[in-house]
Amino acid sequence: SEVEYRAEVGQNAYLPCFYTPAAPGNLVPVCWGKGACPVFECGNVVLRTDERDVNYWTSRYWLNGDFRKGDVSLTIENVTLADSGIYCCRIQIPGIMNDEKFNLKLVIKPAKVTPAPTRQRDFTAAFPRMLTTRGHGPAETQTLGSLPDINLTQISTLANELRDSRLANDLRDSGATIRIG
């Protein structure tokens, strides 16, 4: 059965996938596709790497990590409910029946609606939740800045989001690693 990952509408989704190159820069082709892994390749390919670089990608799909070190985890930007489903990460390791195939289930939840008094600023504007990106797009930091007047619900929401952020990092750090060579 597939490992399940969750994200909210409007957020970025993170689907972990790793391998350990036999030597630095000794990469193997990897593909990501929407749908369970078939016999070869990936169905409905959304991103693909070769032995050197990312050679195919579609909008909203990118590799946030250092794929040259084997972090081929997929980030899906600004997800919608339509992004729910199974995704395939396939690591195309040379040799007889060596491919590593991972089916990851992405569950998209509707965005939480937090009612706030009209005099208060929008929560997401007060707390810009930005992922630190590597390699693609501008480098952004997660920051609180100056605190406006906020209610307990908002503080609770922020705490949950910080916890979820740590959980995502834990998942990233403890993801299954495939050693090649």
Partner: antibody
Amino acid sequence: QVQLQQSGPGLVKPSHTLSLTCTVSGGSISSGGYYWSWTRQHPGMGLEWIGYISYSGSIYYTPSLKSRLTISVDTSKNQFSLKLSSVTAADTAVYYCASLDSWGSNRDYWGQGTLVTVSS
Amino acid sequence: EIVLTQSPATLSLSPGERATLSCRASQSVSSYLAWYQQKPGQAPRLLIYDASNRATGIPARFSGSGSGTDFTLTISSLEPEDFAVYYCQQRSNWPLTFGGGTKVEIK
């Protein structure tokens, strides 16, 4: 456009090794994006997938033939080959080489087919 | 391994008629199903991949549908060159397997 030309003997003795070669023209066998495969068809019967080797070196063999099968690529000659050892009369078939476009699987190319008869 | 059952075994039709061929899988293959056409003495030719996508150069009269375990190949109006044997093939699970074929013959 990729073209595939098969070569190899049409008659093989029982217990010997069947060897077929597929020469690729119109493209480089080492360039990304293709799976190089073999399929066979017993006389008057349906199709049976034998196995493939990918542009990245991934190799898959059908389980029933795995212990006797070798599929390999010779990039210097732009060829890929099939070797099936310890053949019996049950291996008599038309053997096809084929290439499948991995970029969406929307086209494939086939060799002309080689009838291989296993007989003493 | 996944078994593909094609029906009917033989379909007798006249040029201009509509042909409907069925392929049923012993377990779900999602949408990873292809259709091939084979004429006597020739290699197979890919018609449809991923259940419903026409391969390069295939005429619009060929269409595929279905997902999971039940699939259909439809030829909207048979041309003389369409009389051949048609095979379905699943690409979901290793080993890849083909159906037994449906022969479309001239009535």
